[in-house]
């Protein structure tokens, strides 16, 4: 006899990286007929929702109107059908960004390189942080973590046209509190036409959409919550 229900999916909209003082919604998707959802924060009960009518709703949304460092951390959710509770969802790491300072991102040998060249990004921040994160815009979650007193190196190795795109970096004050994003650096990788056609670029977005777009599009996020849980969030573990 089944003792628990399948775990729900948890995700954040528009994104798990939330600029301070901005709003975020934590979504929990369980099953139709669930009479209660519970959101837990760092192991403690944070919020409760009872959808009405439960038989027509399989997802609830928990609103955080004003993101700050005290709200950043690990969230999970569970739901109940009758007296039977679900397994807990995967952990959602909610990150507050735009804290304190802005790092500087540079690339060596430069932003325009030939396929096969070795490329290294450098992220520098002169305040008290030793962890840095390099992110490539696009639906895929290209995230690298680096360490250094005031600067981290991110060697990409010999690049291909798949490395083309717009990069930004963050300084991380702890796992859930990140700096402002750096100014974007667009990496252009030239190769022969045949190779280029075989390595399409990730869908990228204009720089001014960064604030709402960040690592992934909302639609991409909604299409596969499980995949999202296991990719972009893994850097925080």
């Amino acid at each position: 006899q089944q003792q628990t229900l399948p775990k729900p999916f948890i995700w954040a909209e528009p994104h798990f990286m939330v600029p301070k003082e901005k709003q975020v919604t934590i979504c929990c998707q369980g099953n139709y007929g669930a009479v209660e959802y519970q959101l837990h924060f760092e192991g403690s009960l944070f919020a409760v929702d009872r959808p009405k009518p439960p038989e027509r709703i399989n997802k609830v949304q928990f609103y955080i109107p004003d993101m700050n460092s005290r709200m950043a951390g690990q969230y999970s959710c569970i739901y109940r059908v009758g007296e039977l509770w679900s397994e807990p969802s995967n952990l959602l790491d909610l990150v507050v960004t735009e804290m304190y300072d802005t790092p500087t991102l540079s690339v060596h040998p430069g932003p325009e390189v030939i396929s096969g060249e070795k490329v290294t990004f450098y992220c520098r921040l002169d305040t008290a942080t030793s962890m840095f994160l390099l992110l490539k815009e696009g639906r895929s979650s290209h995230v690298q973590r680096g360490y250094g007193k005031v600067q981290a190196e991110f060697p990409l190795g010999p690049v291909t046209t798949a490395h083309r795109g717009t990069y930004r970096c963050f300084g991380s004050y702890n796992n859930h509190a990140w700096s402002f994003p750096s100014e974007p650096v667009k990496l252009l990788v030239t190769g022969d036409i045949e190779n280029t056609s075989l390595a399409p670029e990730d869908p990228t977005f204009p720089a001014d959409t960064w604030g709402t777009y960040l690592l992934t599009t909302e639609t991409g996020l909604q299409k596969d919550h499980a995949l999202w849980d296991h990719t972009a969030q893994n850097l925080l573990r």
Epitope: L45, F46, A47, D49, Y63, P65
Partner: nanobody, 127 residues
Framework: QVQLVESGGGLIQAGGSLRLSCVAS????????MGWFRQAPGLEREFVAG????????YSPDSVKGRFTISRDNAKNVLYLQMNSLKPDDTAVYYC????????????????????WGQGTQVTVSS
Amino acid sequence: QVQLVESGGGLIQAGGSLRLSCVASERSLTLYAMGWFRQAPGLEREFVAGISRTGDTTYSPDSVKGRFTISRDNAKNVLYLQMNSLKPDDTAVYYCAASATYSATNIYTHQRAYGDWGQGTQVTVSS
């Protein structure tokens, strides 16, 4: 922000009842999910009861379930906590709190979810 003022506390014998009120000034309470917390000397602040914006949904922990009832009158901008069968363990300062939310059904149980707090009202239950 919303200003919150609690009242209704006092000294009561074990087994008695009290009704706490929390009046909001300036802004409409309909914008907020509301909650009651309490803090006894030397202990952490503890969630006691929460209610959704519309008042349709409430939640209380097992420690007070069946004894404490939270309700709200959005027309009057008032939040209530009806406390029955009081015990000496219920002695504490009781605080009401408000959390701005778009959701009609969210109830917040964690103090970090609440942005606005009252000054508190003392409830003392004697044996």
